[in-house]
């Protein structure tokens, strides 16, 4: 099956404080190779998350990502800060025969806006 | 430190059942998908069956696919793999191992024997 | 199914390579255990081509092209002395297997 990577929703809203789900899925695994999640493109782009078993502070795979033909690499991000707002990439990998690991495919993007805290 | 501790085996008699355990300790057992390789005497390594980090999904080699079942107590940190109609073929040291995330093994326990003999 | 040499010889020093060929580099991630004794639990050396994992020696290394894999261990020591199976994952099939080990003497 064809390689996509979707992610369905162009922009999500969550208040300061509270946790937010960004969704990404694939229709194939193959060619095998990691997924990874970065917020910003370019140079300048974070890596926020990585399914490849680091350890990252406040966010969570949202599915079973061990399950041998998981299609879901959903991420949950929680207690939230004016700091994560931006747009998150759900990115997909080749593996390569060194480093680093070849980008082949990127969901559309999620933008994420994050509001002040209800007072 | 991650530690892997295999337990259960022995001696059987063909057609009759073992149930191995596997006890999980130094790392977060819920995390991690599990699979269960064994070694015959004077052989190879053999992977048998994996589990995913939730359990709920397995997966088998053909031939121990209808015969083992590979489970997880994550409560326990414990692995577990039912052997139902042993053969002489099943003698091998078995071992549980720990996944990485693409499904190759880190950490090994260190075996136990199961030997099926009349 | 995985095919490496039966086994391979080294002066202490030496670098030597042991090949592992049979996998498809579009579907498959490598592995390389070693056992130092038959019964004995296996340590892993290598995994995903080419990590190492943090407490085994900078003399081992892992690469994949194509579709063999190749495990380098640059000089090599009497205590390496082992059988050095490949291992496989295949993300078409779900399924791990194994070569059948390449037995390396130090001489």
């Known amino acids: 099956k064809e390689l996509k990577v979707t992610q369905p929703e162009k922009s999500v809203s969550v208040a300061a404080g509270d946790s937010t789900v960004l969704n990404c899925t694939l229709t194939s695994l193959l060619p095998v190779g990691p997924i990874k999640w970065y917020r910003g493109v370019g140079q300048s782009r974070l890596l926020i998350y990585s399914f490849t078993g680091e350890h990252f502070p406040r966010v969570t795979n949202v599915s079973d990502a061990t399950k041998r033909n998981n299609m879901d690499f959903s991420i949950r991000i929680s207690n939230v800060t004016p700091e994560d707002a931006g747009t998150y990439y759900c990115v997909k990998f080749q593996k390569g025969p060194s480093e680093p690991d070849t980008e082949i495919q990127s969901g559309g993007g999620t933008e994420v806006y994050v509001l002040a805290k209800p007072s | 430190d991650v530690q892997l501790v295999d337990s259960g085996g022995g001696v059987v008699r063909p057609g009759e059942s073992l149930r191995l355990s596997c006890a999980a300790s130094?790392?977060?057992?819920?995390?991690?998908?599990m699979s269960w390789v064994r070694q015959a005497p004077g052989k190879g390594l053999e992977w048998l069956a994996g589990?995913?980090?939730?359990?709920?999904?397995?997966y088998y080699i053909d031939s121990v696919k209808g015969r083992f079942t590979i489970s997880r107590d994550n409560s326990k940190n414990s692995l577990y793999l039912q052997m139902n109609s042993l053969t002489a073929e099943d003698t091998a040291v078995y071992y549980c191992?720990?996944?990485?995330?693409?499904?190759?093994?880190?950490?090994w326990g260190l075996g136990t024997l199961v030997t099926v003999s009349s | 199914a995985l095919t490496q040499p039966a086994s391979v010889s080294a002066n202490p020093g030496e670098t030597v390579k042991i090949t592992c060929s049979g996998g498809d580099y579009y579907s498959t991630y490598y592995g390389w255990y070693q056992q130092k004794s038959p019964g004995s639990a296996p340590v892993t050396v290598i995994h995903s081509d080419d990590k190492r994992p943090s407490d085994i020696p900078s003399r081992f290394s892992g690469s994949a092209s194509g579709s063999a894999a190749t495990l380098t261990i640059t000089g090599v020591r009497v205590e390496d002395e082992a059988v050095y199976f490949c291992g496989a994952y295949d993300g078409r099939t779900y399924i791990n297997t194994f070569g059948a080990g390449t037995t390396l003497t130090v001489l």
């Open positions: 589990i995913s980090a939730g359990g709920s999904d397995t």
């Open positions: 130094g790392f977060t057992f819920s995390s991690y998908a």
């Open positions: 191992a720990r996944e990485t995330w693409n499904h190759l093994f880190d950490y």
